[in-house]
Amino acid sequence: MEDEKPKVNPKLYMCVCEGLSCGNEDHCEGQQCFSSLSINDGFHVYQKGCFQVYEQGKMTCKTPPSPGQAVECCQGDWCNRNITAQLPTKGKSFPGTQNFHLE
């Protein structure tokens, strides 16, 4: 269940880390892994990493994609390795979002 309280000794997962918060590391350890896409002045900035604290990721991971940002979260070692966040396409039920497809 998504809303379950985390255990006293929560499981930590190894996650791929790519982006501004990673420093020189290519991985991090946390309770959730993520893959995100944000649009900065029209340019696609992809990031991957981890949420150390369950509550930190809980809100972010529940946020539906918007025209300028999308986040996908997962739990499991290296689970974000092959996840690429995508902005919503037409037909998905996120009001006001743009039509964008990866080619």
Partner: antibody, heavy 118, light 106 residues
Framework: EVQLVESGGGLVQPGGSLRLSCAAS????????MYWIRQAPGKGLEWVSS????????YYADSVKGRFTISRDNSKNTVYLQMNSLRAEDTAVYYC???????????WGQGTLVTVSS | DIQMTQSPSSLSASVGDRVTITCKAS??????LNWFQQKPGKAPKLLIY???SLQTGIPSRFSGSGSGTDFTLTISSLQPEDFATYYC????????FGQGTKVEIK
């Protein structure tokens, strides 16, 4: 083959207006963000503006904000740059460019020269 | 805005030389950096994206490296067609280009 062809450049007086066009072919235009970048004579490159796939989100450099407007017509495979209140410092070659999602500014047009002078 | 400082601003080299151009960002941009080549009267051409990925069709003598604030473009063996101006470009935030490095014939 991806092709981007700019047009609409020319000589204009300070305070005047000009509309640049960029006709795209060789790819599914409506799937891609588009960009305008400029280069003043003998100078470096400067990002000017970006537009998302459906035209609903636009972005501008501070130097042109409030004066320039980017738009697109997906039915015509064309992106535009409406330039108002032109200044001498807007004199430049204006390039149209496209990205793929993970490769920014992968393709460029040949450019069109805008000269602002009295 | 993030400032991109390229060095040197110009250099003279001979065919066959190994050439290195550096680009320094005023703050962390991770790997959100491209390198372009421009010849007089022509549009810029993408060489390297995401700091170290070679664009399709670009010769393997071009390579890029770096992360954070310090980046390098290397031409392993300069060819006659490589004499041009090179620009770095960051898109982490407030997209900006470096001022350019002109590679001239010695």
């Amino acid at each position: 083959e991806v092709q981007l062809v700019e047009s609409g450049g020319g000589l204009v007086q300070p305070g005047g207006s000009l509309r640049l066009s960029c006709a795209a072919s060789g790819f599914t235009f409506s799937n891609y963000y588009m960009y305008w970048i400029r280069q003043a004579p003998g100078k470096g490159l400067e990002w000017v503006s970006s537009i998302n796939t459906d035209g609903g989100s636009t972005y501008y450099a501070d130097s042109v904000k409030g004066r320039f407007t980017i738009s697109r017509d997906n039915s015509k495979n064309t992106v535009y740059l409406q330039m108002n209140s032109l200044r001498a410092e807007d004199t430049a070659v204006y390039y149209c460019a496209k990205s793929t999602p993970n490769i920014p500014l992968a393709y460029w047009g040949q450019g069109t020269l805008v000269t602002v002078s009295s | 805005d993030i400032q991109m400082t390229q060095s040197p601003s110009s250099l003279s080299a001979s065919v066959g030389d190994r050439v290195t151009i550096t680009c320094k960002a005023s703050q962390n941009i991770y790997k959100y950096l491209n390198w372009f080549q421009q010849k007089p009267g022509k549009a810029p051409k993408l060489l390297i994206y995401y700091s170290n990925s070679l664009q399709t069709g670009i010769p393997s003598r071009f390579s890029g490296s770096g992360s954070g604030t310090d980046f390098t473009l290397t031409i392993s063996s300069l060819q006659p067609e490589d004499f041009a101006t090179y620009y770095c470009f960051q898109y982490s935030s407030g997209p900006t280009f470096g001022q350019g490095t002109k590679v001239e014939i010695k």
